[in-house]
Interface confidence: low
């Protein structure tokens, strides 16, 4: 004769609230002769969930007929899962047996657990922007999910990130979890266009984590360099000057010339060109009149970058005597 | 006034456990975690682990798996660890402490329970 | 496991000094640094959390400051009363640990 085993397949069963839990159980014998009840918990304590003979239950009913003879599946469903629904459900076989019926055998248990999906991922930078070759924080919060367990990834575009310390709280039973992360990211000169992403994988995600993503051109601040240089042509008794400002990174930018420690309101033109990498260049161009100039022209472009603490190149002008002489043929 | 107090001194026979109690009071004992701290002359202060009496969820520091076991019953206010196969290795002071439930430091300690394990 | 190293096990100093005692952990921490006093024969106290919060009732002369995975407690103006041994605890991810302690005396 076989030995009677009970079958609860699933370890684990995610239920959402409001919805249906179908919690299976089969026996591989029909004997010995007695029913199947199911349980919730363990113990002197455990409360009854089902019993066919007895008893009010009009949340769960069962998958199959439970009156027919040759019956062996006792799964059960019960509708309008609540928070207070979760625990570890056992369907018991008792033996028949005078005055009342004997515990024969219990199945293994299905563990049912609120199923709830994670929240779409936030991720946060720093507060303030941080130069190339430093290293800065960015966190990632989601927020709701059951059960606990809970896989987090950082990527920086696509390469995956390992400085990285994450948290899921509480630490004990919740009905709902949160995760915290925080990832260090050493930034490079050209991540103006580069994208941090906190993934999250979880069991309620079938398999299609969640992403959150932050930019890298809110955190990084790459600073200008600059050159001064004189053009060899003149434009009648004027020399052009001209500031590059190469390089740098957000856009905000004031310049400004200065001709022998006096500040110039004048600039005659201007450009400004984004690179490939996000970052920008800005010339430009300043004419001094070299009429009647003394030979100790300085010329300063002074740049003030993103609220940042000014730099500046200066320029000693050279202005020929040959240069001079002529200046008054030129036609402006 | 926030008090933990500590059950008295225990001497104990080599393989035997002991349950030490850390009774809460002046506060909500549901609404904070309880850790559990051993202190050694060789080790220092080491954290054994943590309840949280209101949802009975644990954490503990592996090193201790299998020597602690922590448990609550919030009918009592009490906290309880019990410690097992007792070996000279586990005579200490042990301290129970509060903290707030989420990663914060312990703010309040009870006086601790001297545990000798001698034959 | 998150290692917390106090540099000096002990240290002396005169009364009315300001010290400093140091404590590294072997990763970052991000500001979860708690520091406890323990007299002798007591249960360790605690002083500062989350690296710079002073707990109730402590004195100001008390101090924390840090980031990363340094971190410091200061002693402005050293009392007789302060001695005993400093632990500092990282809380930002179990298992929580603590350093070896630092034992003040005075000279």
């Known amino acids: 004769e076989e030995e009677l085993q009970m079958i609860q397949p699933e370890k684990l069963l995610l239920v959402t609230v409001g919805k249906t839990a179908t919690l299976h159980c089969t026996v591989t014998s029909l004997l010995p002769v007695g029913p199947v009840l199911w349980f919730r918990g363990v113990g002197p304590g455990r409360e009854l969930i089902y019993n066919q003979k007895e008893g009010h239950f009009p949340r769960v009913t069962t998958v199959s007929d439970l009156t027919k003879r040759n019956n062996m599946d006792f799964s059960i469903r019960i509708s309008s899962i609540t928070p207070a629904d979760v625990g570890t459900y056992y369907c018991v076989k008792f033996r028949k047996g005078s005055p009342e019926n004997v515990e024969f055998k219990s199945g293994p248990g299905t563990e049912m657990a609120l199923g709830a999906k994670p929240s779409a991922p936030v991720v946060l930078g720093p507060a303030a922007r941080t130069t190339p070759e430093h290293t800065v924080s960015f966190t990632c919060e989601s927020h709701g999910f059951s059960p606990r367990d809970i896989t987090l990834k950082w990527f920086k575009n696509g390469n995956e990130l390992s400085d990285f310390q994450t948290n899921v709280d509480p630490t004990g039973q919740s009905v709902a979890y949160s995760i915290r992360s925080t990832a260090r990211v050493v930034l490079d000169p050209w991540d103006v266009r580069s994208q941090v992403i906190c993934e999250v994988a979880h069991v309620t995600l079938q398999g299609d984590p969640l992403r959150g993503t932050a930019n890298l051109s809110e955190a990084i601040r790459v600073p200008p360099t600059l050159e001064v240089t004189q053009q060899p042509m003149r434009v009648g008794n004027q020399v052009n000057v001209t500031c590059q400002v190469r390089k740098f990174y957000p856009q905000s930018l004031q310049l400004t010339w200065s001709e022998n420690g006096n500040v110039c309101q004048r600039e005659t033109a201007s450009t400004l060109t984004e690179n490939k990498d996000g970052t920008y260049n800005w010339t430009s161009w300043f004419l001094v009149n070299i009429s009647d100039q003394r030979d100790d022209v300085v010329l300063t472009c002074q740049v003030k970058h993103d609220g940042q603490l000014a730099v500046s190149k200066r320029l000693a002008l050279e202005v020929t005597v040959h240069q001079k002489d002529q200046s008054s043929d030129a036609t402006p | 006034e926030v008090q933990l107090q500590e059950s008295g001194a225990e001497l104990v026979r080599p393989g035997a456990s002991v349950k030490l109690s850390c009774k809460a009071l002046g506060y909500t004992f549901t609404d904070y975690e309880i850790h559990w701290v051993k202190e050694t002359p060789v080790y220092g202060l080491e954290w054994i682990g943590d309840i949280h009496p209101g949802s009975g969820g644990t954490a503990n520091n592996q090193k201790f798996k299998g020597k602690a076991t922590l448990t609550a019953d919030k009918s009592s206010n009490t906290a309880y660890m019990e410690l097992s196969s007792l070996t000279s290795e586990d005579s200490a002071v042990y301290y129970c402490t509060r903290a707030v439930s989420g990663y914060y430091a312990m703010d309040y300690w009870g006086q601790g329970t001297s545990v000798t394990v001698s034959s | 496991d998150i290692q917390m190293t106090q540099s000096s096990s002990s240290f002396s100093g005169s009364l009315g000094d300001r010290l400093t005692i140091n404590c590294k952990a072997s990763?970052?921490?991000?500001?979860?640094v708690a520091w406890y006093q323990q007299k002798p024969g007591n249960a360790p106290r605690l002083l500062i959390s989350g690296t710079a919060s002073l707990e109730t009732g402590v004195l100001s002369r008390f101090s924390g400051s840090g980031s990363g995975k340094d971190y410091t407690l200061s002693i402005n103006g050293l009392q007789a009363e302060d001695v005993a041994t400093y632990y500092c605890?990282?809380?930002?991810?179990?298992?929580?640990?603590f350093g070896g302690g630092t034992k003040l005396e005075i000279k």
């Open positions: 605890q990282q809380y930002w991810t179990t298992p929580w640990t």
């Open positions: 990763e970052d921490i991000y500001d979860r």
